[in-house]
């Protein structure tokens, strides 16, 4: 039985040209996290973080994605095209797969404040 929940940074906004941390956290389960996948709104992979083997950053994002903090991902040099949904998929044993959603809005405005809060989707 899957007892865990994924907490995410929820809906966030950040400035064009700036950076943002995409973060998910799995709680309420003793399951072992074997791998975390990060996907973009078009379901293309940004990165994989295998618990033992470390990070795989996809070539299309290698200059703009930094691994971490933790199992999270830092997206840099934001463009308007980065607006959209991001998904973290936690592969766990023995529970199976948990998935969290984050919506990122990239704002043109120079006064846009980065906003983020953890929430349960």
């Amino acid at each position: 039985m899957m007892t865990g929940t994924i907490e995410t940074t929820g809906n966030i906004s950040a400035k064009k040209g700036g950076s943002v941390i995409l973060q998910c956290h799995l709680s309420s389960t003793m399951a072992q996290v074997t791998q975390v996948n990060w996907e973009q709104h078009d379901h293309s992979l940004l990165a994989i973080r295998n618990a033992e083997l470390g990070w795989h950053i996809y070539p299309a994002f290698k200059d703009r994605v930094a691994p971490g903090p933790g199992l999270g991902l830092t997206l840099q040099s934001l463009t308007m095209n980065d607006t959209g949904e991001y998904f973290c998929t936690y592969h766990t044993y023995p529970d199976g797969t948990y998935r969290g959603r984050i919506f990122l809005e990239v704002l043109e405005s120079s006064v846009a404040e980065h906003s983020a809060r953890f929430q349960i989707p």
């Epitope: 996907e39 618990a51 033992e52 083997l53 470390g54 795989h56 299309a60 592969h91």
Partner: antibody, heavy 119, light 107 residues
């Protein structure tokens, strides 16, 4: 330039163990995971497992879990693969291969070590 | 485990021919796929990573495409030195798995 140099061929009896070494040079050893892949005669490549030299974490194929042991000696930039309880079907060429920096594809390979299991 | 089915298992072609090899994954692996070339008695060599990126120093006649479950590897104009066995490899999830290989021969 990056080089992975493996130990020489081994002939073992069924039930014995074998330990193959892989000496790395030309890059920072702790920055890339090291993997072991084998190829039995006329067969496809088969991933045994990988080890992250930075923190020693290992990932094994379920098929080899409990029988294969991957270790590293970071001071000597050397990776090891030990396979126990050998049987004739373990006769194969064993390769060490590193995954690219922040990628999982396998960009450099050792020359291979032939392990023959025969009574 | 993710099964990788490669076809054809062997292929005979002439110098200058366009050669296409396919690899099918048993489940969605996004673009977590690499292609390797292996010559007899030698270790494999990385040609293509992340499904479509040519590795450093690999000639432009080699290319890869696909995502999800279906992938293609192409040699646009076969050269004599391309005689080898080619393998696909998924690294979407452990255990990493390889296709059965395609042995390429010259007609």
């Amino acid at each position: 330039q990056v080089q992975l140099v493996q130990s020489g061929a081994e002939v073992k009896k069924p039930g014995a163990s074998v330990k193959v070494s892989c000496k790395a040079s030309g890059y920072t050893f702790t920055e890339n995971a090291m993997h072991w892949v084998r190829q039995a005669p006329g067969q496809r490549l088969e991933w045994i497992g990988g080890i992250n030299p930075n923190q020693g974490g290992t990932s094994y194929s379920q098929k080899f879990q409990g029988r294969a042991t991957l270790t590293v000696d970071t001071s000597a930039s050397t990776a090891y693969m030990e396979l126990s309880s050998l049987r004739s079907e373990d006769t194969a060429v064993y390769y060490c291969t590193r995954s690219s920096y922040y990628r999982y594809d396998l960009d450099y390979w050792g020359q291979g070590t032939t392990v023959t299991v025969s009574s | 485990d993710i099964q990788m089915t490669q076809s054809p298992s062997s292929l005979s072609a002439s110098v200058g021919d366009r050669v296409t090899i396919t690899c099918q994954a048993s489940q969605d692996i996004k673009t977590a796929l690499a292609w390797y070339q292996q010559k007899p008695g030698k270790a494999p060599k990385l040609l293509i990573y992340s499904a479509s990126y040519r590795y450093t120093g690999v000639p432009s006649r080699f290319s890869g495409s696909g995502s999800g479950t279906d992938f293609t590897f192409t040699i646009s104009s076969l050269q004599p030195e391309d005689i080898a066995t080619y393998y696909c490899h998924q690294h979407y999830t452990t255990p990493w798995t390889f296709g059965g290989g395609t042995k390429l021969e010259i007609k």
